[in-house]
Interface confidence: low
């Protein structure tokens, strides 16, 4: 029986409990003076629960508490006794669920050393569900006297939550180390106690794939269940307006935070959390025609497209060759430049340079094709938007965390202890870009233009098929020696107007005279996903011209010429490390396939925890 | 055998990441240069690797990361007899060959010598005093000699610093990854994203199977002040969290 | 960020046990290779080596101290201890923390280094 | 145990010029081809700073204009140009050998 309000929670014992428990507590009734007083209480799932035993109406001076279940020796396992503050506290997890029974005795020692039971007391904890305090305590309980609760999101508004992952089991603590660790926490999360969840994995589902951003903690591996620390950020927010997490981002990476909490820090998410609805009563739902509304053609036209922030490690960035809105300049950061989003235009083959920073960027521009670079993880140098070849006057890593509107930092400053500073609140327009120092996702979105009725391939009432038109020039894509690279074919390259966009045509890439690019080339081209991908070599520096054909269900096809210009390896021999490694096999049947050289760098990738295989340079493959 | 060179593109160039460099390192490799089952698994089956060597070069060039020379312990009270160390430059079979065999040789040649020259001191002391009987149980209860070639070094004891996992054991698993690892990130997320994001589990089919690293990585024997050459190494206690 | 920061009585008196808390962050000494060791300077004079301890519970002494010396660490709360017995006046200096990392080709230097504790011994 | 001299145990220097410290040891500080000494920058109220390990090569953030060199027994730094902020006492320090052993330390005034 589950009360459909807290204030329900079980008062009336004889009437309420279940069988089991009456023999219980008909027995502690008879034994001792009952004392009513202590009020029932609900816990949540996840939340800290903490009340204070009013000892007063039970023991008086030399007497002796003594706390546990109804008719038990001991607390239920998600309780703790604080004897000197005389307070209950504790954090339950799922599997606690249910009404509690909780007694307060006070004995007073016997002449001959026992025992002699005073007055006892019984009350209940009932402990909800964990998305009973989303609708109950986040958006309409009232707050306990001298709480300060955050305001409270609308209805339908989703709150944005930040979640830190621990690698840690709930279940192998005790309940003063979860309360403990919620303490600890409150130093990052500046949160109260009772603002905080703290719940275990479940499923390994580690990460929220709803999440809009994250960051690392100092752990690489998870070792334990794993548990999600969290706390509410805010209402709807987005990666533009999130408030500063510096004080989380930082300390999660450098280990600082699992120097304070006790233990390592998996990593950290943004996300946006949907409020769970009430339940409601089925009716009969009547199907109704549902209009359709086509996906219109990219325009080639100045726009604003909508902003988005796709940071694959392994697809191209889009840095616009038009002046575009970026944060203020801040001091130098090591690591990765920040993600920034950008309009269509110039597509970069982007270094990335150390930890990516979270931040908030609006921007305008006008939407210009460009040039696609695939993006890979060079640190080296830092690339202009016009310049084939990485400039090498800069060796030291560029410390930059925001576009910058001159040439990198060269700063020598050790990174260990240089820190960014507090993101600034509002972004404020900066020169035009030359530092490309973004990673998204080559794509736009097309506004819809006209509404149709049908979504099929062919032609409405006999009007002939028309040819699909390219719309925006791939132009060229950047690669470097020994350096993994692919590049997603933008979805707004090619429009159809029977069958829409890029991703509804079919792709193939060919070389000069409609030749098929070959199972053994450097280059490969997977037309079911509409990447393309390679590892070139030596040999293979220079300009290369290829073609990307996009036919429609009709068999019409448009083409789009592009270049791939491949690039000496940007370090040089300037790369501080060396790796070598022996296998066993005839090297040649390594160095003669394209595939086998893709799979050892993607596996090289692999071991060192990294899914971005362009942070691998192949230096060499020789017989050993 | 196939020799593959590679570098690591989140390394930044300038001044020299040694620490970074570290840490990758003993991520794929043991001090000795052997590959980590994480390692291993990674690349296995198509790859099968025997051993691995990590240089510093460029802004590291006066550093040797695997195959390490331990440091040698120091002690205020009583140095240790110097042991000539080895050349980093070797390659790590050698380093697996100086570090088991030859020694386990070596202390073999010393027990049999010391037997046969207690043996010799033994029957001089008691010459012709000896029954058939007295001499069958000496023999029975004397210590066995074995002889150098009887040593068995086809395959050299498992190296303590490596955690002992049994073959049934299942390895824990692998955090989200998020990208770069090696070099972390904040990252805003978007859906089409999320696939470079997703936690490597159990349940992910292409995950490779991950066998953790030791939780310590450097060299476990004595820090004084320089290094020294001495084995084996002692594992250490295990991360557990306070 | 590398932090060391030293904490200490300030003032005691001849014979006591100077006790001394070095409190990090940024690092941790669960992590192989990591050490924290500890060296004192009396006003207006050089520095002297004192003791250090590694991750793995390794400590070093310096022999002339010895005997007066007791090194310790708390990984979990990122602290390292140091007690000197039966103290005198000769005592009487700033005591330092600080880190000592090993790599392999570098020399152990002690690259991160605490603001120093100042303490006086006096009757 | 090891001693360190360090040589001059002042030294005065315009603005701009070389200024060159010396550390000898009283035995060899190097091991297996790499020299276990390291220079330490201490300035009045601050503790000393890491400038230069195994003889020569610079920590990170420190500026090029420091530089160190020598092996055995014999130890140089070497600073130029010298600037303002670089008065301070320099100290030799090596690591080859318990107990650590630190140089007396040299002053640097400039003129």
């Known amino acids: 029986h589950w009360p459909s309000e807290p204030s329900e929670a079980v008062r009336d014992w004889e009437n309420q409990l279940e069988a089991s428990m009456h023999s219980v507590l008909s027995d502690l009734h008879e034994a001792v003076p009952t004392v009513v007083g202590i009020p029932d209480g609900t816990a949540v799932v996840g939340r800290s629960f903490r009340v204070t035993i009013p000892t007063d109406l039970i023991a008086s001076s030399g007497d002796i508490i003594k706390v546990s279940a109804a008719g038990k020796e001991a607390l239920p396992s998600w309780l703790h006794w604080d004897s000197q503050s005389h307070t209950l506290e504790g954090l339950p997890l799922d599997t606690d669920k249910g009404v509690h029974y909780i007694s307060v005795s006070a004995t007073r020692l016997g002449a001959n050393g026992s025992h002699i039971p005073q007055t006892s007391s019984v009350f209940s904890i009932e402990v909800y569900p964990e998305d009973h305090s989303e609708l109950q305590s986040v958006r309409t309980a009232s707050p306990d006297p001298g709480e300060v609760v955050s305001s409270a999101c609308a209805a339908d508004e989703p709150v944005t939550v930040l979640t830190v992952i621990l690698d840690a089991d709930l279940t192998k603590m005790t309940p003063k180390q979860r309360i403990d660790l919620l303490h600890r926490m409150r130093s990052f999360s500046e949160v109260e106690l009772h603002n905080m969840k703290l719940v275990p994995v479940v499923n390994n589902r580690l990460f929220d794939m709803s999440a809009f951003m994250a960051g690392p903690g100092n752990a690489k591996k998870v070792v334990e269940n794993g548990a999600l620390l969290s706390w509410k950020l805010g209402c709807s927010l987005n990666q533009n307006s999130v408030p500063d997490i510096h004080g989380v981002e930082a300390p999660a990476r450098e280990g600082a935070m699992s120097a304070q909490l006790g233990y390592p820090v998996v990593g950290w998410h943004i996300a946006n959390k949907k409020p769970p609805l009430p339940k409601r009563v089925r009716r009969q739902i009547h199907a109704t025609p549902t209009p359709v509304t086509a996906i219109g053609p990219p325009t080639t036209a100045i726009q604003e497209p909508p902003s988005r922030i796709v940071p694959t490690p392994t697809s191209p960035a889009i840095a616009p060759p038009t002046e575009t809105m970026a944060p203020p300049v801040r001091d130098p950061v090591p690591g990765k430049p920040t993600v920034t989003i950008r309009t269509r235009g110039a597509i970069i083959q982007t270094p990335t340079l150390g930890p990516i920073q979270p931040t908030r960027v609006s921007e305008a521009g006008t939407t210009v094709p460009g040039q696609i670079r695939p993006t890979m993880t060079i640190p080296g140098y830092v690339e202009p938007t016009a310049v084939a070849t990485p400039p090498t006057t800069t060796t030291k890593k560029p410390r930059v965390s925001t576009p910058k509107p001159a040439t990198p930092s060269t700063d020598s400053t050790t990174t260990t202890t240089r820190r960014p500073t507090k993101k600034p609140r509002t972004p404020r327009p900066v020169p035009r870009v030359t530092t490309k120092v973004s990673i998204t996702r080559l794509e736009t979105a097309s506004p819809p233009t006209r509404i149709r009725t049908t979504t099929s391939g062919v032609p409405r009432g006999g009007e002939p098929n028309q040819r699909p038109e390219l719309k925006n020039h791939i132009d060229r894509v950047d690669a470097w020696v020994g350096t993994y690279f692919e590049v997603k074919i933008p979805s707004d390259t090619f429009y159809d107007h029977e069958d829409t966009t890029t991703d509804k045509l079919k792709l193939t890439l060919k070389l000069r005279e409609q030749q098929l690019v070959g199972e053994k080339s450097w280059v490969q081209f997977n037309s079911n996903s509409q990447l393309m991908y390679g590892l070139p070599d030596s040999s293979h520096v220079g300009k290369h011209e290829y073609f990307m054909h996009a036919t429609d269900k009709g068999g019409l096809s448009a083409v789009d010429a592009f270049e791939i210009h491949v690039h000496r390896r940007p370090q040089g021999d300037r790369a501080p490390a060396r790796f070598k490694a022996k296998f066993v096999g005839d090297p040649a049947l390594v160095l003669n396939d394209i595939h086998k050289k893709i799979a050892l760098v993607k596996k090289l990738a692999f071991a060192f925890g990294d899914r971005n295989c362009s942070t691998i340079t192949l230096q060499n493959i020789t017989r050993g | 055998s196939i020799v593959v060179e590679w570098t690591n593109n989140t390394l930044p160039l300038e001044p020299c990441p040694k620490e970074q460099i570290a840490g990758l390192s003993r991520r794929i490799a043991e001090d000795d240069g052997k590959p980590r089952p994480a390692f291993s698994n990674a690349l296995e089956p198509d790859f099968k690797a025997t051993s691995i060597t990590v240089t510093g070069s460029g802004s590291c060039r006066h550093l040797q990361f695997i195959p390490v020379v331990p440091p040698r312990r120091v002690p205020s009270e009583a140095p240790p007899t110097e042991v000539p160390d080895r050349d980093p430059e070797k390659s790590s079979e050698d380093d697996v060959y100086l570090h088991t065999v030859i020694p386990a040789v070596v202390v073999a040649a010393i027990l049999l010598i010391a037997g046969i020259i207690a043996m010799i001191c033994y029957r001089k002391k008691r010459k012709g005093k000896l029954t058939l009987e007295d001499q069958a149980t000496f023999i029975k209860k004397g210590v066995p000699i074995i002889f150098a070639d009887e040593l068995d070094d086809s395959k050299p004891p498992p190296s303590s610093s490596m955690p002992l996992i049994l073959q049934e054991e299942k390895a824990p698993l692998p955090p989200p990854e998020y990208p770069n690892q090696s070099v972390p990130e904040t990252t805003p997320l978007n859906q089409d994203t999320m696939g470079e994001y997703t936690p490597l589990r159990d349940e992910d089919p292409n995950a490779p199977p991950y066998q953790p690293p030791p939780p310590f990585t450097a060299p476990m024997e004595g820090k004084g002040s320089r290094p020294k050459n001495m084995t084996p190494y002692r594992s250490p206690p295990p991360y557990v969290p306070p | 960020q590398v932090t060391l920061k030293e904490s200490g009585p300030g003032i005691l008196k001849p014979s006591q046990t100077l006790s001394l808390t070095c409190s990090f962050s940024?690092?941790?000494?669960?992590?192989?290779?990591?050490?924290v060791g500890w060296i004192r300077q009396p006003s207006g004079k050089g520095l002297e080596w004192l003791a250090h301890i590694w991750w793995d519970d390794d400590k070093y002494y310096n022999p002339s101290l010895k005997s007066q010396l007791t090194i310790s660490k708390d990984t979990s709360r990122n602290q390292v201890f140091l007690k000197i017995t039966s103290v005198d006046t000769a005592d009487t200096a700033t005591y330092y923390c600080?880190?000592?990392?090993?790599?392999?080709?570098?020399?152990?230097?002690?690259?991160?280094w605490g603001q120093g504790t100042s303490v006086t011994v006096s009757s | 145990d090891i001693v360190l001299t360090q040589s001059p145990t002042s030294l005065a220097v315009s603005l701009g010029q070389r200024a060159t410290f010396s550390c000898k040891a009283s035995q060899s500080v190097d091991y297996d081809g790499d020299s276990y000494m390291n220079w330490y920058q201490q300035k009045p109220g601050q503790p000393p700073k890491l400038l230069i390990y195994a003889a020569s090569n610079l920590d990170s953030g420190i500026p090029a204009r420091f530089s160190g060199s020598g092996s055995g027994t014999d130890f140089t730094l070497n600073i130029h140009p010298v600037e303002e902020e670089d008065a301070a006492t320099y100290y030799c320090q090596q690591s080859n050998e318990d107990p650590l052993t630190f140089g007396a330390g040299t002053k640097l005034e400039l003129k």
């Open positions: 600080a880190r000592r990392a090993y790599y392999y080709g570098s020399s152990y230097p002690m690259d991160y």
């Open positions: 940024g690092f941790s000494l669960s992590t192989s290779g990591m050490g």
